[in-house]
């Protein structure tokens, strides 16, 4: 493979590598394709030791526009030379290539979470996978944002060990009978744009005082 040819056409694919639920997911979008591919095949090699391109087994002849590379791409030091081939039936429509370096190219999707509202606190249950590879920890910290009446408060819970298994955080000292919204995201040690989760909102139940006041009426 020649990696350093001076003639380049504008790539016809846009790639994105994301850490989604602590899995390395490569996704792609096509630019200006009149014929939409029926399936794709993804191949790669390591740039420091270029060998024949290896087909990613679970992404050969796939109809999906993403590929889970967690078990293939294990190093945050290597650059992975990636080739995406698009087919319509037996005809090759296009081939796009790009090099990925996980340490700098990875974006971090927010974890799944649930909230349960109580009178004066909210339980935030963040779902992490039971086991997370050391290479995929990426020096990340969990951020929980609490919003109410235009005021945003950031919580940075300390997680002992690595981010694995379910994690519960309590946002306390809240005001009963008030609407609160919560968003979670993973913050990288670098100045990288964060991807925040959609807000989940709950109206806290009224407290004891307002309950007794209501019953007295």
């Amino acid at each position: 493979i020649s990696y350093d040819s001076p003639d380049y056409t504008d790539e016809s694919c846009t790639f994105k590598i994301s850490l989604r639920n602590f899995r390395s997911i490569l996704s792609w979008e096509l630019k200006n394709h009149s014929i939409v591919p029926t399936h794709y095949t993804l191949l790669y090699t390591i740039m420091s030791k270029p060998e024949d391109l290896k087909v990613v087994k679970n992404c050969a002849n796939t109809t999906r526009s993403f590929c889970d590379l967690t078990d293939e791409w294990r190093s945050t030091h290597e650059a992975y030379v990636t080739v995406l081939e698009g087919f319509s039936g037996n005809t090759t429509l296009f081939s796009c290539s790009h090099n990925f370096w996980l340490a700098i190219d990875m974006s971090f999707e927010p974890p799944e979470f649930e909230i349960v509202g109580f009178t004066n606190h909210i339980n935030v249950m963040v779902k992490f996978p039971s086991i997370v590879e050391e290479e995929l920890q990426f020096d990340l910290s969990l951020v929980i944002e609490e919003q109410s009446e235009g005021i945003v408060k950031k919580h940075k819970p300390e997680i002992k060990g690595n981010m694995s298994g379910n994690f519960t955080y309590i946002i306390d000292k809240l005001i009963p009978n008030t609407n609160y919204c919560v968003s979670v995201y993973l913050e990288h040690s670098d100045e990288q744009a964060v991807i925040k989760s959609p807000l989940k909102c709950t109206l806290l139940p009224p407290g004891q005082e307002s309950e007794s006041a209501e019953s007295a009426k």
């Epitope: 990696y3 350093d4 040819s5 001076p6 380049y8 790639f15 740039m47 420091s48 294990r74 190093s75 945050t76 030091h77 290597e78 650059a79 290539s97 790009h98 090099n99 370096w101 340490a103 700098i104 190219d105 990875m106 974006s107 050391e134 290479e135 670098d190 100045e191 990288q192």
Partner: antibody, heavy 117, light 112 residues
Framework: EVQLQQSGPELVRPGVSVKISCKGS????????MHWVKQSHAKSLEWIGV????????KYNQKFKGKATMTVDKSSSTAYMELARLTSEDSAVYYC??????????WGQGTSVTVSS | DIVMTQTPLTLSVTIGQPASISCKSS???????????LNWLLQRPGQSPKRLIY???KLDSGVPDRFTGSGSGTDFTLKISRVEAEDLGVYYC?????????FGGGTKLEIK
């Protein structure tokens, strides 16, 4: 042959900012990350940081956060580094260097920045 | 940050004689992927740095085989079997295992 062409020398007053450039040619620019390295007599070589030429993601050496800002313009295959609030300590030669993963393989010719009143 | 310490500061060698430069890191440079991202650069007078060796012992293309890199963990060595006039300049070791990447202070090779 791969080339990293850096902008010319800069003589600047203390307190101002300077933006230096590094244009990559004869290779696919967005396939390689771009690093910036400072070389001064006092401190030998110091790694400032790295930018993803495809996504624009950055990673800085803590020491240079707030001092250096790295950006990239894919359309012109050019990486930039702006140095803010310059002092005499910032007088140095600044190199760009490309990498594939953790492998730095080519360096620019360097840009000399002299801070003097 | 990892500190890279190079010795000697200056090395004065006769053409045709061997030379050896030591580089020590304050922490192990062996990564969890099994590789050691220890590299050597040469900066000739008035030029920008050029890669000589990467991954402890792999020579960059065009680098003569009189250069050898060795070592593991925290202790590394660059050896030149027979020094030639074109070898003069400053040699730097640097590590890319841990961010921020860090460089040694340099060793100036002079020709006697």
């Amino acid at each position: 042959e791969v080339q990293l062409q850096q902008s010319g020398p800069e003589l600047v007053r203390p307190g101002v900012s300077v933006k230096i450039s590094c244009k990559g040619s004869s290779y696919k620019f967005t396939d390689y990350a771009m690093h910036w390295v400072k070389q001064s007599h006092a401190k030998s070589l110091e790694w400032i940081g790295v930018i993803s030429t495809y996504y624009g993601n950055v990673k800085y050496n803590q020491k240079f956060k707030g001092k250096a800002t790295m950006t990239v313009d894919k359309s012109s295959s050019t990486a930039y580094m702006e140095l803010a609030r310059l002092t005499s300590e910032d007088s140095a030669v600044y190199y760009c260097a490309r990498s594939y993963g953790s492998y730095l393989d080519y360096w620019g010719q360097g840009t000399s920045v002299t801070v003097s009143s | 940050d990892i500190v890279m310490t190079q010795t000697p500061l200056t090395l004065s060698v006769t053409i045709g004689q061997p030379a050896s430069i030591s580089c020590k890191s304050s922490q192990s440079l062996l990564d969890s992927d099994g590789k050691t991202y220890l590299n050597w650069l040469l900066q000739r007078p008035g030029q920008s740095p050029k890669r000589l060796i990467y991954l402890v012992s792999k020579l960059d293309s065009g680098v003569p085989d009189r250069f050898t890199g060795s070592g593991s963990g925290t202790d590394f060595t660059l050896k030149i079997s027979r020094v030639e006039a074109e070898d003069l300049g400053v040699y730097y070791c640097w590590q890319g295992t841990h961010f921020p990447w860090t460089f040694g202070g340099g060793t100036k090779l002079e020709i006697k």
